[in-house]
């Protein structure tokens, strides 16, 4: 039985050109963590931690994805394109899969202000 | 292209043993989570190990736990199947299957070898 | 363990044809379902993963949809080489389990 629930950095906004952390936090569960999945809103895969071979950034994104911290992922230079949904998937034995949703906002003002809360989607 | 070939299947009396054994080639297999997967004469489907790309966790479901076990070596490209303590219902054709890197679903499967246990 | 139901054993449709399978989960199984063809000579291949991802070199007549505890596979022109049989997948919870299986025929 599935136990598990992931915590996520939920709605945030962040300002063009500066740098974000996409956070996915699994909890209430023992389960063993085989990978975590790092998504955007296109479906296209960010990044992969994998619990033996380590990190692995795609190469379409090596540039502005650095890994960390911990499970999380970190998105440099943002751009107005980078709005939308990011997706963390986590993969675990014995409960199975867990999936997790932040969205992200890119704001064009340089007043805007970087905001984060922990909410369980 | 990636081409996993299945050797191994025989026929086998109830309690005995057999080994599979999936050969790998057309891709980094070190870097992959494998699995086997087996199709009964009734043509369903059930999965029945998968180990991850290093080999440090292997997962059963219930119905082989504890009488199969799955393994790997990576030098060789050569993925394992050792079966013991064999059942009427353990006839199938045993699928080797790799894994896409996102773990979504299983994207290349062998050919499959027939194994059949009777007395 | 998740029961995965293919109610359709097996159907028969002409080519040209549009042609939809369905597959229904005991539980939400929150889009992680997968689908495969097996043709008549046991040759297995991925279709479609997480519910509506077309795997690569995948023609794009097949597509995928649903949600929670009900999906569908279609094949929008049935074409000669589609005579197969599908099997769904859950990757939701272990043990992973597929559905019993929809032979396609000519009709």
């Known amino acids: 039985m599935m136990t598990g629930t992931i915590e996520t950095t939920g709605n945030i906004s962040a300002k063009k050109g500066g740098s974000v952390i996409l956070q996915c936090h699994l909890s209430s569960t023992m389960a063993q963590v085989t990978q975590v999945n790092w998504e955007q809103h296109d479906h296209s895969l960010l990044a992969i931690r994998n619990a033996e071979l380590g990190w692995h950034i795609y190469p379409a994104f090596k540039d502005r994805v650095a890994p960390g911290p911990g499970l999380g992922l970190t998105l440099q230079s943002l751009t107005m394109n980078d709005t939308g949904e990011y997706f963390c998937t986590y993969h675990t034995y014995p409960d199975g899969t867990y999936r997790g949703r932040i969205f992200l906002e890119v704001l064009e003002s340089s007043v805007a202000e970087h905001s984060a809360r922990f909410q369980i989607p | 292209e990636v081409q996993l070939v299945e050797s191994g299947g025989v026929l086998v009396k109830p309690g005995g043993s057999l080994k599979l054994s999936c050969a790998a080639s057309g891709f980094t297999f070190s870097n992959y989570v494998m699995s086997w997967v087996r199709q009964t004469p009734e043509k369903r489907l059930e999965w029945v190990a998968t180990?991850?790309?290093?080999?440090?966790?292997?997962y059963y479901p219930d119905s082989v736990k504890g009488r199969f076990t799955i393994s790997r070596d990576n030098a060789k490209n050569i993925l394992y199947l050792q079966m013991s303590s064999l059942r009427s219902e353990d006839t199938a054709l045993y699928y080797c299957?790799?894994?896409?890197?996102?773990?979504?679903?299983?994207?290349?499967w062998g050919q499959g070898t027939s194994v059949t246990v009777s007395s | 363990d998740i029961q995965m139901t293919q109610t359709t054993s097996s159907l028969s449709a002409s080519l040209g044809d549009r042609v939809t399978i369905t597959c229904r989960a005991s539980?939400?199984?929150?889009?992680?379902l997968n689908w495969y063809q097996q043709k008549p000579d046991g040759t297995v291949k991925l279709l479609i993963y997480y519910t509506s991802r077309l795997h690569s070199g995948v023609p794009s007549r097949f597509s995928g949809s649903g949600s929670g505890t009900d999906y569908s596979l279609t094949i929008s022109n049935l074409e000669q080489e589609d005579i197969a049989t599908y099997f769904c997948?859950?990757?939701?919870?272990?043990?992973?389990?597929f559905g019993g299986g929809t032979k396609v025929e000519i009709k």
């Open positions: 299957t790799r894994w896409l890197l996102s773990l979504y679903a299983m994207d290349y």
């Open positions: 539980q939400d199984i929150s889009n992680f």
């Open positions: 180990i991850t790309s290093g080999g440090t966790y292997t």
């Open positions: 997948q859950q990757g939701k919870t272990y043990p992973y389990t």
